[in-house]
């Protein structure tokens, strides 16, 4: 099993531009989670889906952030417009 697959691995963008992160969860997993990690703020849960439905998006109250899961094998996290403080490592995770 390839595990959770994210793309891109690295992203550099200018402030104000749109950024889209993609995730392919492990096949058969019905829950998907997006996290953000920075030195200053630690690990933050942004949103999680269960059976493609967003259950809790309270980790991303800024409407610059949006996430979708159109089907069981794909999710996107979009930032529009991006800001310097969005610089972070973004993790996608999945579970049964």
């Amino acid at each position: 099993d390839a595990g959770v697959i994210q793309s891109p691995r690295h992203e550099v963008t200018e402030m104000g531009q749109e950024v889209t992160l993609r995730c392919k969860p492990i096949s058969g997993h019905n829950s998907l989670f997006w996290y953000r990690q920075t030195m200053m703020r630690g690990l933050e849960l942004l949103i999680y889906f269960n059976n493609n439905v967003p259950i809790d998006d309270s980790g991303m109250p800024e409407d610059r952030f949006s996430a979708k899961m159109p089907n069981a094998s794909f999710s996107t996290l979009k930032i529009q417009p991006s800001e310097p403080r969005d610089s972070a490592v973004y993790f996608c995770a999945s579970s049964l």
């Epitope: 703020r41 630690g42 690990l43 933050e44 849960l45 942004l46 259950i55 809790d56 309270s58 980790g59 991303m60 109250p61 800024e62 409407d63 610059r64 529009q80 417009p81 800001e83």
Partner: antibody, heavy 117, light 106 residues
Amino acid sequence: EVQLVESGGGLVQPGGSLRLSCAASGFTFSNTGMHWVRQAPGKGLEWVSYISSGSSTIYYADTLKGRFTISRDNSKNTLYLQMNSLRAEDTAVYYCARRGEGAMDYWGQGTTVTVSS
Amino acid sequence: DNQLTQSPSFLSASVGDRVTITCRASSSVNYIYWYQQKPGKAPKLLIYYTSNLAPGVPSRFSGSGSGNEYTLTISSLQPEDFATYYCQQFTSSPFTFGQGTKLEIK
């Protein structure tokens, strides 16, 4: 029916501390983000702080960072605001509000904080 | 911080009038949200995501706009609409409010 009930307000001297509480009912508190907003007498609304469902994401108004601390206890369905080093300009009605529709869709009735010697 | 400026700050109007309140942002925002507050009461959400009416809000209220400029329109004022209205942005923390528009009976 969604209900938010604030408590803990009162009269406090400058430099003092106060902890506000907001008891929530009628919705799944444990997966809902929550805000504090305040309103000084005769003034407009001022956003204070936000906390996500699991407390991993927290934001504060720049002017209040370091003095105010937002927290929550999901087992008690309660939101808190710890306010330290209080100043006269912190005198206001403090509201808790639920995050919903991308905004604040339900509000409590407010609790009054007066900072005066 | 993104500063929101509402105009006018005060507005006198009569029952049946059509009124428009403007909210201008110092930096572009994705959406604007509108609240109504009556004296001694908590604010009430009117419009979310720029143009969506919150549950129970009459259809005489509408919202529009994009970028830096947004509007709240009341098509035919009713006695219960006399209140103070606030805009707010959630595009970027801190989640600033406009200074408010007080709508009074002429």
